[in-house]
């Protein structure tokens, strides 16, 4: 039998990730929920212990007994100022046991206290189990990553956590080192290279500068902000929408924990959407006092909300460069790590800072550290594979896949051109009171209505207990394997009752010619489908332009180049438009376009005057005439409770 593989684990502050190198490539392993990263959360209830997604999903219901951020405690003394500061923000209790911090929770009716190593070991156990479920055999050998700034005590405590989890820790390696390995930067054969790793995760921000020479890694400098990450961006969105709800409905939801939790979930998903789309919709049914909250946000507005946070990421970059005694021109490679580096504005700020230098971002930033750890684990296990760095070229889904929802609407779970294999899950509900079953009708195609798309198959999920409309939760999962075989499963979350259908390439699927025809048809009928999209697009263009102009004239670099009168003129008009937008989200396309042209009439003469002869277009990457039109609306964010 082949030798058991060793795994690489990125033990993160908010999320963890596990990978394995086998058959000449790295596989990042999805958990039982289909997610390739797992929350570093452990929850204790009256009946059970939950780890990962299950723990995070119930955090609002059980905050005192849901533990996260163990990485902020591990290897530290109770009296450490970091521990004392962080404790103020945690809903769970941290107690002092001989100057060692312990987390105190209620578990199965008893008070229990756990060391941070124990909590981390539970997360590591989960990651080990995820790998074992995938590989089909027990796993013991692992490489675990830690931040470059971790001291010996923190490293040893992390290793201990691995041992508690039943792992043989082959090595503790630095997260930035792992990311550099993932990109093969240790094997370029170009002599000494200076690599800057920019790691913006869920809760922390780390900048590291490494020197790599002949396979030897040396950490030259580290900097960062231990409390900056994706969660901060989520908070800005939550605050923004709380204010919007106040404006629209004259009600304050901020004290209602369930409403805020549901809003935060939608905000996190909207944020992710905004990395690939210029607009995201939020649809939360009965958010507060029976009020449905349907709204949207543009990328430009999100960037404005977080502008100070995004800009602040450059300070640690400058500090790391100073500490490493390097000029930015001496950095050979820039590596992006952490989910928040998907944010286009963050990438642009970094790229602009380094004068347009290319960023290493081809590996999923959530997974780069685990990827490198998996490569390192394979090397330490003696894998002599030549193609340790080869990447698998993934196939894609040629058409969107989805199901029919109320009114014959096509709700896509897997978007056209998604790489496969892939798995997507979404919660649906009933349309009528006491509805006994749901008909799951699976379609492929790009049209807004299912009648215009191709029916792949249908099945019924019956036996739903009587309940008012909107109460039952039907979890639908679309899972395409590497061979393009689609499994659709529907599960009633209250009873656990499930039904499924398997759709293979040869059964009801479209040929290449039919796919081509459907894509062309979708183009032909775009006008019908896009009346709404055009409206949103016009809104989008206006909002983006307003925020871009506001940001342009507020740019410190323009001090002295623009008169105060002109600056005021632009800012006043931007404020007028932004406020108008807030109050008129449902205005017509013509109104949005009129406002944009009005704003352009004020801004363009002023802005173009600044950039004429400056060897390039104006701010935001468009010329003096500003952006025309705007891209279509982003994917809708469905409610997830």
């Amino acid at each position: 039998m082949a030798k058991a593989a060793a795994i690489g684990i990125d033990l993160g502050t908010t999320y963890s990730c596990v990978g394995v190198f086998q058959h000449g490539k790295v596989e990042i392993i999805a958990n039982d929920q289909g997610n390739r990263t797992t929350p570093s959360y452990v929850a204790f209830t009256d009946t059970e212990r939950l780890i990962g997604d299950a723990a995070k999903n119930q955090v609002a219901l059980n905050p005192q007994n849901t533990v996260f951020d163990a990485k902020r405690l591990i290897g530290r003394k109770f009296g450490d100022p970091v521990v004392q500061s962080d404790m103020k923000h945690w809903p769970f209790q941290v107690i002092n046991d001989g100057d060692k911090p312990k987390v105190q929770v209620s578990y199965k009716g008893e008070t229990k206290a756990f060391y941070p190593e124990e909590i981390s070991s539970m997360v590591l156990t989960k990651m080990k189990e995820i790998a074992e479920a995938y590989l089909g055999y027990p796993v013991t050998n692992a490489v675990i990553t830690v931040p470059a700034y971790f001291n010996d005590s923190q490293r040893q405590a992390t290793k201990d956590a691995g041992v508690i989890a039943g792992l043989n820790v082959l090595r503790i390696i630095n997260e930035p080192t792992a990311a550099a390995i993932a990109y093969g930067l240790d094997r370029t054969g170009k002599g000494e290279r200076n690599v800057l790793i920019f790691d913006l995760g869920g809760g922390t921000f780390d900048v590291s500068i490494l020197t790599i020479d002949d396979g030897i890694f040396e950490v030259k400098a580290t900097a960062g902000d231990t409390h900056l990450g994706g969660e901060d961006f989520d908070n800005r969105l939550v605050n923004h929408f709380v204010e919007e709800f106040k404006r629209k409905h004259k009600k304050d939801i901020s004290q209602n924990k369930r409403a805020v939790r549901r809003l935060r979930t939608a905000c996190e998903r909207a944020k992710r959407t905004l990395s690939s789309s210029t607009q995201a919709s939020l649809e939360i049914d009965s958010l507060f006092e029976g009020i449905d909250f349907y709204t949207s946000i543009t990328r430009a507005r999100f960037e404005e909300l977080c502008s100070d946070l995004f800009r602040s990421t450059l300070e640690p970059v400058e500090k790391a460069l100073r500490d490493a005694k390097l000029d930015k021109a001496q950095i050979h490679d820039l590596v992006l790590v952490g989910g928040s580096t998907r944010i286009p504005k963050v990438q642009k700020l970094l790229q602009d800072f380094f004068n347009g230098r290319d960023l290493n971002k081809s590996i999923n930033p959530d997974e780069a550290v685990a990827y490198g750890a998996a490569v390192q684990a394979a090397i330490l296990m003696g894998d002599k594979s030549e193609n340790v760095q080869d990447l698998l070229l993934l196939d894609v889904a040629p058409l969107s896949l989805g199901l029919e929802t109320a009114g014959g609407v096509m709700t896509a779970l897997i978007k056209r051109n998604s790489t496969i294999p892939t798995k997507q899950t979404q919660i649906f509900t009933t349309y009528s009171d006491n509805q006994p079953g749901v008909l799951i009708q699976v379609y492929e195609g790009e049209r807004a209505m299912t009648k215009d798309n191709n029916l792949l198959g249908r099945f019924e999920l019956s036996g739903i207990p009587p309940a008012p409309r909107g109460v039952p939760q039907i979890e639908v999962t679309f899972d395409i394997d590497a061979n393009g075989i689609l499994n659709v499963t529907a599960t009633d979350k209250s009873t656990g009752k499930a039904n499924k259908i398997t759709i293979t390439n040869d059964k009801g699927r479209l040929s290449k010619e039919e796919i081509e025809r459907m894509v062309q048809e979708a183009e032909k009928y775009k006008a019908e489908d896009e009346v709404q999209r055009e409206r949103v697009s016009a809104k989008n263009a206006l909002e983006s332009y307003a925020f871009n102009m506001k940001s342009a004239v507020e740019d410190e670099g323009l001090k002295g180049k623009i008169s105060e009168a002109d600056k005021k003129k632009v800012l006043d008009k931007c404020q007028e438009v932004i406020s108008w937008l807030d109050a008129n989200t449902l205005a017509e396309k013509d109104e949005f376009e009129h406002k944009r042209k009005e704003l352009e009439q004020v801004c363009n003469p002023i802005i173009s005057g600044l950039y004429q002869g400056a060897g390039g277009p104006g701010p935001g990457g468009f010329g003096a005439q500003g952006p025309k039109g705007g891209s279509g609306s982003g994917p809708t964010i469905e409610e997830v409770d």
Epitope: Q575, I578, S579, D582, N584, E600, Q601, P605
Partner: antibody, heavy 116, light 112 residues
């Protein structure tokens, strides 16, 4: 001083076209939008739309889409309003008006009479 | 589309007396961010082009006599001519610029 000077009165037959000009002076033409307003005999003011003089992008109200075209010539600081397929109910005075916080400067108006 | 309804249609006032013209909007013209109402008033004398009197509800255009004043917020607005002069005989129009632009139907002011 700021002035908007419009072309003279026109008498046209139904089905014909007319092009009214509005020459601006005393300010930077491309810094302000130019609006067009119609006033039928004995009637009130009716906003037709406007043109962004910097980008050349026009905006037409629903009632004035199709037969009407707003254009500019920035080299001569002139805005134009062309009306095709004239009908008798197009008989009116057509005003151009500069827009700052409101329509602060107006042309003297051009009477277009459509009569067979 | 925002509709502006002016009242009365015509008004006869003695010289030196106060003239009051109302303008009602089908929706609020208040921008909560700028705290401005986007309503303007224009004067059109017989055979002449309209002339801007007031914008943003109450800001007088330069050169406009201070007997002209504007007030109101949201949907209800008023133009007041404090002491009517002979040269004030004209048709007065309100116009909104909150979203797109629309004019009211006009109010004719005459001397009684």
């Amino acid at each position: 001083q700021i002035q908007l000077v419009q072309s003279g009165a026109e008498v046209k037959k139904p089905g014909a076209s007319v092009k009214v000009s509005c020459k601006a002076s005393g300010y930077t033409f491309t810094n302000y939008g130019m609006n067009w307003v119609r006033q039928a005999p004995g009637q009130g003011l009716e906003w037709m739309g406007w043109i962004n003089t910097y980008t050349g992008e026009p905006t037409y109200t629903d009632d004035f889409k199709g037969r009407f075209t707003f254009t500019t010539d920035t080299s001569t600081s002139t805005a134009y309003m062309e009306l095709r397929s004239l009908r008798s109910d197009d008989t009116a005075v057509y005003f151009c008006a500069r827009y700052d916080h409101a329509m602060d400067y107006w042309g003297q108006g051009t009477l277009v009479t459509v009569s067979s | 589309e925002i509709v502006l309804t002016q009242s009365p249609d015509s008004l006869a006032v003695s010289l030196g007396e106060r003239a009051t013209i109302n303008c009602k909007s089908s929706q609020s013209l208040l921008n909560s961010g700028t705290r401005k109402n986007y309503l303007a008033w224009y004067q059109q004398k017989a055979g002449q082009s309209p002339k801007l009197l007031i914008y943003w509800t109450s800001t007088r255009e330069s050169g406009v006599p201070d007997r002209f004043s504007g007030s109101g917020s949201g949907t209800d607005f008023t133009l007041t001519i404090d002491s009517l002069q002979a040269e004030d005989v004209a048709v007065y129009y309100c116009k909104q610029s909150y979203t797109l632009y629309t004019f009211g139907g006009g109010t004719k002011v005459e001397i009684k």
